[in-house]
Amino acid sequence: KKEDGESTAPTARPKVLRCKCHHHCPEDSVNNICSTDGYCFTMIEEDDSGTPVVTSGCLGLEGSDFQCRDTPIPHQRRSIECCTERNECNKDLHPTLPPLKDRDFVDGPIHHK
């Protein structure tokens, strides 16, 4: 979900935005800081083994409105939050995994202890 309000079409920021990046740092990042004309994000999702993994970084303006909308994906537990209000604003984003649905237990992978 977007933390700073929805807009119908993304408008270009007058200045570059710096974001914290983790597991999602582009080549042009330095010291785990990336730069963008769009949004900072933090995302939590389950990996193949069902372990929650947190990633953060930069989303370019192109397509970021769609990516920040956090549309549910079947059989994939994932949540993303985006922000633009200040540099490294995504340090303070803490998305949580959506609750498991009954169907997820049936359709999802079976984990053996």
Partner: antibody, heavy 116, light 112 residues
Amino acid sequence: QVQLQQPGAELVKPGASVKLSCKASGYTFTSYWMQWVKQRPGQGLEWIGEIDPSDNYTLYNQKFKGKATLTVDTSSSTAYMQLSSLTSEDSAVYYCARFGYYVDYWGLGTTLTVSS
Amino acid sequence: DVVMTQTPLSLPVSLGDQASIFCRSSQSLVHSTGNTYLHWYLQKPGQSPKLLIYKVSNRFSGVPDRFSGSGSGTDFTLKISRVEAEDLGVYFCSQSTHVPFTFGSGTKLEIK
């Protein structure tokens, strides 16, 4: 129109510190980063660092970490760069420059002379 | 740091001639957003630099259309189609893709 006003010259002694100023007008100060660039006579331009006046966030060139400190006063739309432990190597013209995704406007520069 | 290599260092021209200045970066200047942050500035004696071209090929406001920029990746060119007296000075390329931002060493455009 966008203007970045800098004092023309500063003369300081070796070992001392100096605080250079850059007063911005003609635009919303917090909507752009402010960068500082060094130019020595006959040499190229060197990027020192930048500050975002909206949240005081700074990025420095490693080479100038510990030498330069960038600050802003949003009430007067003024950016500052403090240079410490000055030596003759710090004698140069220092420019402030407005930055969005590229520098579009430069100050006229302050000529810093470090001499006893 | 990204090294910006400019050629030639000096460019003697006759007024009305075409002039080309080249800039090569030590790594690609294509940013992760897809933009290429390569820019050109002109510095006249005793003045601060002035922006001519931003993001490879976009003329800044008030810049005459005899100035044009081109290139991609690591190789870029600034062309002046018909040199005028007011064009004389030192031209710098600059990149703002990678921190620290860096500049070319400059090309001095002078009368032949």
